[in-house]
């Protein structure tokens, strides 16, 4: 791994579990620079593997609301606008970090958690199982 | 919003900035259950809008390594295996939370940061700009 020289101005940690437990400032710094949010926000409808977005809410998690993609069809939309079952619509998933309140219901104590979320769908050639 | 009853066993926060600064346990709980990792890991190659994965490393960020998708083509792969420019390969982007060391180089002090990452690509019908 990469060794980071320690900044002498770092806060001290009196926590016995240091460095397992760290301080996190929840004032989010937003580094997003989506150059055209309007255009990219309609991909879910214009895709050959379109998807719907479902709201998943969990007050014990931060962020409490996550939007999940569910593919609309099992197949993909062809040039005629029909579902073609020779291709498969599949979810593109990403592992993300969230904060889970631990102990439960605590406003200022969390544990990092990895979850797998579906971000959108893509059209793939199927694995061949059935040979004529 | 949802009001969460406070657990009496919560750790106290002596921090003046509470609740802006919280304690986070970095022992990650992995809730991932990819039910078909063997089959789903090759979508980037089997998609009609295939992508390459590029490694982005930043020691001041947690996680320090993030993989970013870049679409291989401007168009989409058709049934003949050729690139069809009547369709567009576009990146599916997601806003994710990461931890940024703050002050820099500190091992136990972070700030939440939102970044936009490209997770994969999907094939979309283009927006018509040119009418014959």
């Amino acid at each position: 791994g990469i060794t980071i020289p320690r900044n002498p101005g770092c806060p001290n940690s009196e926590d016995k579990n240091f460095p397992r437990t760290v301080m996190v400032n929840l004032n989010i710094h937003n580094r997003n620079t989506n150059t055209n949010p309007k255009r990219s926000s309609d991909y879910y409808n214009r895709s050959t593997s379109p998807w719907n977005l479902h709201r998943n809410e969990d007050p014990e998690r931060y962020p409490s609301v996550i939007w999940e993609a569910k593919c609309r069809h099992l197949g993909c939309i062809n040039a005629d606008g029909n579902v073609d079952y020779h291709m498969n619509s599949v979810p593109i998933q990403q592992e993300i970090l969230v904060l889970r309140r631990e102990p439960p219901h605590c406003p200022n104590s969390f544990r990092l958690e990895k979850i797998l979320v579906s971000v959108g769908c893509t059209c793939v050639t199927p694995i061949v199982h059935h040979v004529a | 919003g949802i009001t969460i009853p406070r657990n009496p066993g919560c750790p106290n926060s002596e921090d003046k900035n509470f609740p802006r600064t919280v304690m986070v346990n970095l022992n990650i709980h992995n809730r991932n259950t990819n039910t078909n990792p063997k089959r789903s890991s090759d979508y980037y190659n089997r998609s009609t809008s295939p992508w390459n994965l590029h490694r982005n490393e930043d020691p001041e960020r947690y996680p320090s390594v993030i993989w970013e998708a870049k679409c291989r083509h401007l168009g989409c792969i058709n049934a003949d295996g050729n690139v069809d420019y009547h369709m567009n390969s576009v990146p599916i982007q997601q806003e994710i939370l990461v931890l940024r060391r703050e002050p820099p180089h500190c091992p136990n002090s972070f700030r939440l940061e939102k970044i936009l990452v490209s997770v994969g690509c999907t094939c979309v019908t283009p927006i018509v700009h040119h009418v014959a």
């Epitope: 998943n56 569910k70 979810p91 579906s118 199982h129 059935h130 | 259950t33 039910t35 078909n36």
Partner: nanobody, 125 residues
Framework: QVQLVESGGGLVQPGGSLRLSCAAS????????IGWFRQAPGKEREGVSC????????YYADSVKGRFTISRDNAKNTVYLQMNSLKPEDTAVYYC??????????????????WGQGTQVTVSS
């Protein structure tokens, strides 16, 4: 050759039961999630159930929960779908396929392979 073969369909009265089988040849099901999908006349193909190999997690469509049970026998390289309390709306061609369960609540399934002939299930009095 790599193949998944569905069998066990037939004509059954409402309230009756059937057990569908999906047998794999040419590859082992040990590390694959396998599921059942169906297509009713004039309707889109839809996911019915899927069973993971890794952690045994399962997916069931809301319309079949409590009535259908998916199971696997890796020794026989076969996946089964036990269908009880059948209704006329269960009439469809049933297909098996490798699948992926997804969603934070394991509430969706996607097919990953090509489709076979399927097996016809007709529920009628």
């Amino acid at each position: 050759q790599v193949q998944l073969v569905e069998s066990g369909g037939g004509l059954v009265q409402p309230g009756g039961s059937l057990r569908l089988s999906c047998a794999a040849s040419g590859f082992t099901l040990d590390d694959d999630a396998i599921g059942w999908f169906r297509q009713a006349p004039g309707k889109e193909r839809e996911g019915v159930s899927c069973i993971s190999s890794s952690d045994g997690s399962t997916y069931y469509a809301d319309s079949v929960k409590g009535r259908f049970t998916i199971s696997r026998d890796n020794a026989k390289n076969t996946v089964y779908l036990q269908m009880n309390s059948l209704k006329p709306e269960d009439t469809a061609v049933y297909y098996c396929n490798t699948c992926q369960i997804y969603g934070l609540g394991h509430d969706a399934a996607a097919p990953l392979g090509s489709w076979g002939q399927g097996t016809q299930v007709t529920v009628s009095s």
